[in-house]
Interface confidence: low
């Protein structure tokens, strides 16, 4: 039809002016389409190199709408993970410094000749909070014991206490229980508590990175030409006005957006779990009760101590023998104050209550994210028509669109008409990423039974048999010396989005 | 649907202790907060305080500690509302309400029970 | 104790007025997460508070959309752009920032 021929380019003109291009390359009247290569070849405004131009710029265009989806989910990831990061770090702060106001006066010298031993177990408490790789367990009974041995030493100056001595007093305290039931009460409350804290945080880091990695896979060239045809073939086809098909579009972004889809199903594991361990922030052996006083548990054991003094020396002279008199040391100490510090009345506050809230909510939101990425970058990014009629763009021409809407996921688009999918070879940063959410659900699941996976059948030496894989950089698989706690470096990167000084911060 | 169960009235004397319920059925008991509210005849709303149902974990406005105790039976989806010490000031109508397990609001109220202090 | 102040106490309206309900708190009450937990209910004669905004500006489910909050810090507002008969009742305002959390006075709107 020599009237089509003579068609004025003036609307592509001004499209593709509007992107940066030369003008220059813009045919004034549409020309014959042998040339294109993606477009369908009728009569076109589009000369080869405006085709690969609009190519390359479809094709950058998907991907900078896919980071920016990407880019909201982290960021709502990374302030829940700050959130619950510094509710979670307050409440340990705020319990050391109670002990270091209260104990002094409490305890007297039993305190302030020990601080050390105190401060030592907060921090160590603190890096296991934050992901290294140590025993909590271990920690703790190291913890009594040496505070054992130094308490003795300090009631019993009147005695020589040499280290073989003290070594019979280690061996005899399971059986004597120095310090009362606090020790077996902290650890079990401990445990669970912090494995809970630390396994939902590392979640949310876990989240956070699994989204930033997946948004830098790059779309292959078979999606470049779909999406191509899909946003700019009308325009060289002289059919500006018409927007793309809802289920054309939809099928192009299945295709293009195949193997993220596989991640939904671990994805929605993950983000379960995590809401199911909030279960375990509250009661007696939540989160906010035990973390927020340690320093109870402490005072209890000291008291403990203090009361059993007696029957404790007499039952250790039993065991390990009688000890050789100081003859330089003072009298036998004075029977102590009973430090009292009832446990803590924690006013209310209804922070975590609010954040679990908050997260609830937004993690649901986000649970169908990776298979609502093609429907929702059409409807927000694509213009698309507003109806499935014959009047909008199918990737042909102006008219219905008649294939069926593919299935989610690589599997299902083995009959994608719009992209050639090679179902065969799923992208190997995906499925690396679908083994992290894998790995950290097991965390979680672990957690949410009490059980700290790193150290489940953990030999002597410390190491662990889980995988580490929750801690995102090669700081958090260093192990941990437990005898070196007063020279170790915060291990701050274990939970992903925390800087190295903001660890230093509240150690 | 969701509801919240709760006995019209309760009648108590000066110094004794009721014990009220709110039976919740329509949904999953334990994934919702269960909160109190007080409204005496012609004033305003005053919170109580929560329950955990799922852990047991409650939590009170200081003014209530000593007055109220609030308990949960997972296993007939009950909440519980001791009142103690009872005085003509705790004459009022007692809300037990759902706390929206993703929205932190007050999303179903039970009809209220009537508590009359009288000797 | 954060102080929820309503005003006015009773509001007079005829059906299609549009109606104005302030509600100011003691303090701020934007909990520390960001958020604004100021909410709006409505209580009919005999029946149980039902809920009709949160966070200040959300209507709730099946809530009329001549029901509207506004406000930010310490003052709010709810507004209802033509009273029906349906609305007479006592609103009450009420915060779940800080614990414990407080309702206002409420104030009843009811027929000129």
């Known amino acids: 039809d020599p009237a089509s021929k003579s068609r004025s380019c003036g609307e592509v003109r001004q499209i593709y002016g509007a992107k940066g291009f030369s003008l220059s390359d813009v045919p004034q009247a549409e020309i014959s389409g042998e040339h294109l290569r993606i477009c369908p070849q009728g009569y076109t405004c589009c000369t080869s190199e405006m085709e690969e131009n609009l190519a390359n710029r479809s094709h950058a265009e998907l991907e900078t709408a896919l980071r920016d989806s990407s880019r909201v989910l982290q960021a709502m990831l990374a302030t829940q993970l700050r959130s619950f990061d510094d509710h979670f770090q307050h409440l340990l702060n705020d319990s050391e410094r109670t002990l270091q106001a209260t104990f002094p006066g409490a305890f007297g010298e039993l305190y302030t000749q020990n601080a050390r031993a105190f401060r030592d177990l907060y921090s160590e408490l603190r890096l296991y909070y934050r992901g290294a790789n140590l025993h909590l367990e271990e920690t703790l009974a190291e913890f009594w014991a040496r505070l054992l041995e130094r308490l003795f030493k300090q009631l019993h100056p009147q005695l020589l206490l040499p280290d073989d001595y003290l070594d019979c007093l280690g061996k005899q305290a399971e059986a004597l229980r120095p310090f009362g039931e606090a020790p077996r009460e902290l650890r079990l409350r401990a445990t669970r508590a912090f494995v809970a804290a630390r396994s939902f945080v590392q979640g949310l880091g876990v989240a956070s990175d699994v989204v930033r990695k997946v948004a830098q896979v790059p779309l292959g060239p078979e999606c470049s030409r779909a999406v191509m045809k899909l946003v700019y073939c009308a325009h060289c086809l002289g059919v500006p006005g018409a927007r793309p098909c809802p289920d054309y579009c939809r099928n192009v972004l299945k295709g293009c957006l195949a193997n993220q889809a596989d991640l939904d199903a671990e994805w929605r594991n993950l983000l379960d779990s995590m809401v199911l361990i909030t279960d375990k922030f509250w009661g007696t052996s939540g989160v906010e009760s035990v973390i927020g006083s340690v320093h109870t548990w402490l005072a209890e054991a000291i008291n403990a101590l203090q009361d059993n003094r007696d029957t404790l020396t007499a039952k250790v002279i039993q065991g390990c023998g009688n000890p050789k008199v100081n003859p330089q040391g003072p009298g036998p100490e004075e029977k102590r104050r009973r430090g009292k510090l009832a446990p803590r009345e924690r006013p209310p506050s209804g922070t975590l209550e609010k954040l679990v809230s908050e997260a609830k909510a937004q993690l649901r939101d986000v649970q169908d994210f990776w298979i609502s990425l093609p429907g929702t970058l059409c409807s927000e990014k694509m213009a698309l028509s507003t109806a499935s009629d014959d009047r909008c763009w199918n990737g042909m021409a102006r008219g219905r669109y008649l294939p069926e809407v593919m299935g989610d996921g690589l599997a299902n688009q083995i009959n994608n008409p719009e992209v050639e999918v090679d179902i065969t070879k799923p992208d190997m940063t995906i499925r690396q990423q679908i083994m992290q959410l894998k790995i950290m659900t097991n965390r979680l699941r672990s957690a949410y039974n009490g059980n700290d996976v790193d150290f489940q059948d953990a030999s002597d030496d410390g190491s662990g048999s889980g995988s580490g894989d929750g801690c995102l950089d090669d700081l958090c698989s260093r192990k941990v010396s437990r005898k070196s706690s007063s020279s170790r470096t915060p291990l701050t990167h274990a939970l992903p989005g925390l800087s190295e000084q903001e660890g230093q911060k509240t150690s | 649907q969701v509801q919240l169960q709760q006995p019209g009235a309760e009648l108590a004397k000066p110094g004794a202790s009721v014990k009220m319920s709110c039976k919740a059925s329509g949904y999953t008991f334990t994934r919702y907060w269960m909160h109190w509210v007080k409204q005496r005849p012609g004033q305003g709303l005053e919170w109580i305080g929560y329950i955990n149902p799922s852990s047991g974990y409650t939590e009170y406005n200081q003014k209530f500690k000593d007055k109220a105790t609030l308990t949960a039976d997972k296993s007939s989806s009950t909440a519980y509302m001791q009142l103690s010490s009872l005085t003509s000031e705790d004459s009022a109508v007692y809300y037990c309400v759902r706390l929206g397990d993703y929205s932190y609001y007050f999303d179903y109220w039970g009809q209220g029970t009537t508590l009359t202090v009288s000797s | 104790d954060v102080v929820m102040t309503q005003t006015p106490l009773s509001l007079p309206v005829s059906l299609g007025d549009q109606a104005s309900i302030s509600c100011r708190s003691s303090q701020s009450i934007v909990h520390s997460n960001g958020n604004t937990y100021l909410e709006w209910y409505l209580q009919k004669p005999g029946q149980s508070p039902k809920l009709l905004i949160y966070?200040?500006?959300n209507r709730f489910s099946g809530v009329p959309d001549r029901f509207s909050g506004s406000g930010s810090g310490t003052d709010f507002t709810l507004k209802i752009s033509r009273v029906e008969a349906e609305d007479l009742g006592v609103y009450y305002c009420?915060?779940?920032?800080?614990?414990?959390?407080?309702f206002g006075g409420g104030t009843k709107l009811e027929l000129k």
């Open positions: 009420f915060q779940g920032s800080h614990v414990p959390w407080t």
């Open positions: 966070k200040v500006s």
